[in-house]
């Protein structure tokens, strides 16, 4: 069986600046050298890809330049940060981990992190 357990926090509250961070941890069954991490958002039974990065073990995650995600890796743990979030982005963010190389291929899917985003109240007008 090529099952792989992926753990992530159940709930995270985004900061007032629309930034949310969480850890995605996977129980690697083998000695993978190439790992792909994908963040997917599930809302209203629709699944969309938020961002994805492939990295070599021991190296940094590299997301596309226009990605809203950044991250670092340490062993079997990936620290993910999603920025630019608004209230409408509230939803379940699922961490998917694929061990790409060497074979065999493994796939693990977390249960998801519910990210709550609250848009900040606009500052009241001031005479000063």
């Amino acid at each position: 069986c090529k099952a792989m357990h992926v753990a992530q926090p159940a709930v995270v509250l985004a900061s007032s600046r629309g930034i949310a961070s969480f850890v995605c941890e996977y129980a690697s069954p083998g000695k993978a050298t190439e790992v792909r991490v994908t963040v997917l958002r599930q809302a209203d039974s629709q699944v969309t890809e938020v961002c994805a990065a492939t990295y070599m073990m021991g190296n940094e995650l590299t997301f596309l330049d226009d990605s809203i995600c950044t991250g670092t890796s340490s062993g079997n743990q990936v620290n993910l940060t999603i920025q630019g979030l608004r209230a409408m982005d509230t939803g379940l963010y699922i961490c998917k981990v694929e061990l790409m190389y060497p074979p065999p291929y493994y796939l693990g899917i977390g249960n998801g992190t519910q990210i709550y985003v609250i848009d900040p109240e606009p500052c009241p007008d001031s005479d000063f």
Partner: nanobody, 125 residues
Framework: EVQLVESGGGLVQPAGSLRLSCADS????????MGWYRQAPGKQRELVAT???????NYADSVKGRFTISRDNAKNTVYLQMNSLKPEDTAVYYC???????????????????WGQGTQVTVSS
């Protein structure tokens, strides 16, 4: 990135034949079991045939005796020979690993697995 590329679909008359191919340019093929899935309009995706790395095959009752799955391990390719096609075989066909290999439900694998674009098979006179 997992890259599964399905081809070989098309329009065929009832009782006709088609041969689908699926090439894997990534590493998923090294998994023991590969399968062909299909999704008809308005219906759930279903697994119709699987093949292990050693060549053992399994089929859904609806295609038994008509479809044959095979694989070429050297080319990282899996095939589906479809004979005696029926209008109810009309669907988009996808190849992927057997979802059970990952300890996932079919629904979860459909939602979160890595899928190719599929190839359309239309059986109509």
């Amino acid at each position: 990135e997992v890259q599964l590329v399905e081809s070989g679909g098309g329009l065929v008359q009832p009782a006709g034949s088609l041969r689908l191919s699926c090439a894997d340019s990534g590493s998923i093929f090294s998994i023991n079991t590969m399968g062909w899935y299909r999704q008809a309009p308005g219906k759930q995706r279903e697994l119709v045939a699987t093949i292990t790395s050693s060549g053992s095959t399994n089929y859904a009752d609806s295609v038994k005796g008509r479809f044959t799955i095979s694989r070429d391990n050297a080319k990282n390719t899996v095939y589906l020979q479809m004979n005696s096609l029926k209008p109810e075989d009309t669907a988009v066909y996808y190849c992927n690993a057997d979802y059970r290999d990952f300890g996932l439900s079919m629904e979860r694998f459909i939602d979160f697995g890595s899928w190719g674009q599929g190839t359309q098979v239309t059986v109509s006179s």
